[in-house]
Interface confidence: low
């Protein structure tokens, strides 16, 4: 037989396939000229001995073959004996090792077999219905297709799909989509409406990430409030790395995550802006306020499920750095200013009470008092914190109110509202022999002394009756008790206690008399 | 709280061979997938085997398909990475990691990961 025709005789191999799972296999064969013919396989497994032999079966039942040595592309023409016009069986034998393989049979008229490619260039993703739909450019004089796609993911193995017949400019594929794992696909296609045509090769991959972004594992941690009252935010941990299907390992365009930072300032809500996106990368500055700090993972698909942290307030205190005067027109604060053109957010809530019930004040932008202060007032009407209880408050400055991450905090502490030297008065004062000449004078503790740095000290006033001579006692704002010694028998005393505070004086409780008995010996 | 604490790390000759060992605890072991995954140097992190809870469904990264064998031993709560045939590209700081779930292919993610062993390949 001529190498240029397919020779009617047997095969120069014995006729039994070996059933292994190596082998030929994905014959095509087209008409690739007017008069010329293609066929090409793949073959799995060791290449080293292996000659292959392309089969032809006519309609008619005879068979023959082309000798193709170890290629594994063999081109003919309409000469070399094969029924061109007419539907013909192909498959490839291998003979190797001793044994025969066989590649699965393709049955088709080879004149109208066109040689298809498979999508090429971009191929657009999206998401449809829950579903993926791939879109792309009809290869040139190609309209007229059958599309199929293959998927897999890291963990399983290559699953076919049908896109369907295709009839125009643009081919498009629904295909499923994963919510959590990443997807590789290939499409191939074939001409529509001829019978045994051969399919194209496979497209590049097509990298898709699930429809949920995967969440990072990361944990936040904020070192301690500066001196400019600002603290860093710092991440504990990377993001964690999505696992890729083998084909979309190293660069897989279109499996990106895009990882944000949203901070949502929970502090001093009269402020303009609450929240503000950042790149993950970039750890902001935060005031020493309460946040929630969310990370934001999208992808091509939009953004995936919220993680989010709470990053409590500082709460640390200062208890000097607020001076309060209260006047008969209102209360004014006054503290040390940050610098020029300053806004300040002025936060105050009753203590123990849920964060939610905070109210805030917002200043306009003020320039340092010539003593360098900044001050904050309010009257009496207004009703800020003008109840006889203890608040917290917190004062935070910024040059630029509307950007989040350049609010810091100026100062933390305790005010006593309303009436504070009156109600501070301490109650319940009594009086008890001591010995003598000593009494131990009692009371219950101020309301002051509820809230932390507020209550300097108590005063303790004992007045003789008779000389009309007063002595005042100090006492720390953590007792309660003072022993009043060197007291005469048998004179009338008083005695009473006021709590006072940094910057005002308490008022005094209700005199207590008291006497001395005089002993009386037997 | 997770804690796993990877150990066998160390300097080795192209062509030899190490045995990394991790000791999981903080959670029910026997109940988790369990991953290897490295870091070379200057690189992201790379997925390199998987064993899912029971032990007969196990995956590798093409790079150590042949050469790596990976194991548990769910008694005593410890995963194993025999490394064999060595190579200089093998050399990256090795994680054990926890999956989200009991199959080795029921998350693509690692929830928790230890602190990692050297492992240095080079003549």
């Known amino acids: 037989c001529r190498t240029s025709e397919c020779c009617f005789q047997d095969p120069p191999y014995p006729d039994a396939d070996s059933g292994s799972a190596s082998g030929p296999r994905d014959l095509r064969c087209y008409r690739i000229s007017s008069d010329r013919y293609e066929c090409s396989w793949q073959y799995e497994g060791p290449t080293a001995g292996v000659s292959h032999f392309l089969r032809c079966c006519l309609s008619s039942g005879r068979c023959c073959y082309f000798a193709a040595g170890s290629a594994t592309r063999l081109q003919f023409s309409d000469q070399a004996g094969v029924s061109v016009l007419y539907t013909v069986t192909l498959w490839v034998e291998s003979w190797a090792r001793n044994q025969t393989e066989k590649s699965p049979e393709v049955t088709l008229q080879l004149y109208n077999s066109v040689k298809y490619e498979p999508p090429l260039g971009d191929i657009k993703v999206s998401k449809l219905a829950g579903q993926l739909r791939m879109e792309w450019e009809t290869p040139d004089n190609q309209v007229g297709a059958e599309v199929q796609f293959r998927h897999r993911t890291p963990s399983s193995p290559w699953k076919l799909g049908d896109c369907g017949p295709q009839d125009d400019d643009t081919e498009s594929c629904l295909c499923p989509l994963e919510m959590n794992v990443a997807q590789e696909f290939q499409l191939r296609r074939r001409q529509l409406g001829s019978q045994g045509s051969s399919w194209s090769k496979w497209s590049s991959p097509v990298c898709v990430p699930p429809e949920n972004p995967p969440q990072p594992q990361v944990r936040f941690s904020v070192e301690q409030l500066g001196q400019d009252g600002r603290r860093r935010l710092t991440l504990k941990e990377q993001p964690t790395q999505l696992e890729l299907p083998e084909g979309c390992q190293g660069l897989a365009p279109g499996t990106e995550v895009t990882y944000r930072l949203q901070l949502h300032m929970l502090s001093c809500p009269c402020k303009a802006k609450a929240t503000r996106t950042l790149h993950l990368g970039k750890m902001p500055y935060l005031s020493g306020a309460a946040y929630n700090v969310a990370v934001i993972s999208s992808n091509q698909f939009g953004p995936g499920l919220n993680q989010t942290w709470h990053i409590p307030a500082d709460t640390h205190t200062e208890p000097v750095a607020l001076n309060i005067s209260v006047g008969t027109n209102g209360t004014t604060m006054y503290w040390p200013a940050r610098a020029q053109s300053m806004t300040y957010c002025i936060e105050w809530q009753p203590v123990g009470q849920d964060g939610g019930l905070a109210t805030c004040s917002l200043t306009a932008p003020q320039d340092p008092d010539p003593a360098g202060m900044a001050t904050y007032s309010w009257s009496r009407e207004s009703g800020a914190m003008g109840q006889e209880k203890c608040y917290y408050i917190t004062i935070f400055a910024s040059a630029h109110p509307e950007k989040l991450t350049l609010w810091s905090t100026v100062l933390s502490t305790y005010h006593f509202g309303g009436n504070a030297s009156a109600a501070g008065t301490p109650h319940h004062v009594s009086v008890k022999n001591h010995s003598l000449d000593s009494v131990s004078v009692d009371w219950a503790p101020s309301l002051l002394s509820t809230c932390p740095g507020v209550l300097k000290e108590y005063v303790v006033r004992c007045r003789d009756e008779d000389s009309k001579q007063v002595s005042e006692h100090p006492v720390q704002p953590t007792e309660t008790q003072v022993t009043l010694s060197g007291l005469r028998a048998g004179v009338a005393y008083t005695v009473q206690v006021r709590a006072d505070t940094a910057w005002l004086r308490g008022v005094w409780s209700q005199p207590q008399r008291f006497s001395i008995e005089v002993q009386v010996s037997d | 709280q997770v804690q796993l604490v990877e150990s066998g790390g160390g300097l080795v000759q192209p062509g030899g061979s190490l045995r990394l060992s991790c000791i999981a605890s903080?959670?029910?072991?026997?109940?988790?997938?369990m991953k290897w995954v490295r870091r070379p140097p200057g690189k992201g992190l790379e997925w390199v085997s998987v064993?899912?809870?029971?032990?007969?469904?196990?995956k590798y990264s093409d790079a150590v398909r042949g050469r790596f064998t990976i194991s548990r031993d769910n008694a005593k709560n410890t995963l194993y990475l025999q490394m064999n045939s060595l190579k200089p590209e093998d050399t990256a700081v090795y994680y054990c990691?926890?999956?989200?779930?009991?199959?080795?292919?029921?998350?693509?993610?690692?929830?928790?990961r230890g602190q990692g062993t050297q492992v240095t390949v080079s003549s």
């Open positions: 990691a926890k999956s989200n779930g009991g199959s080795a292919f029921s998350s693509v993610l690692y929830t928790d």
């Open positions: 903080g959670f029910t072991f026997s109940d988790y997938a």
């Open positions: 064993i899912d809870s029971e032990g007969p469904t196990i």
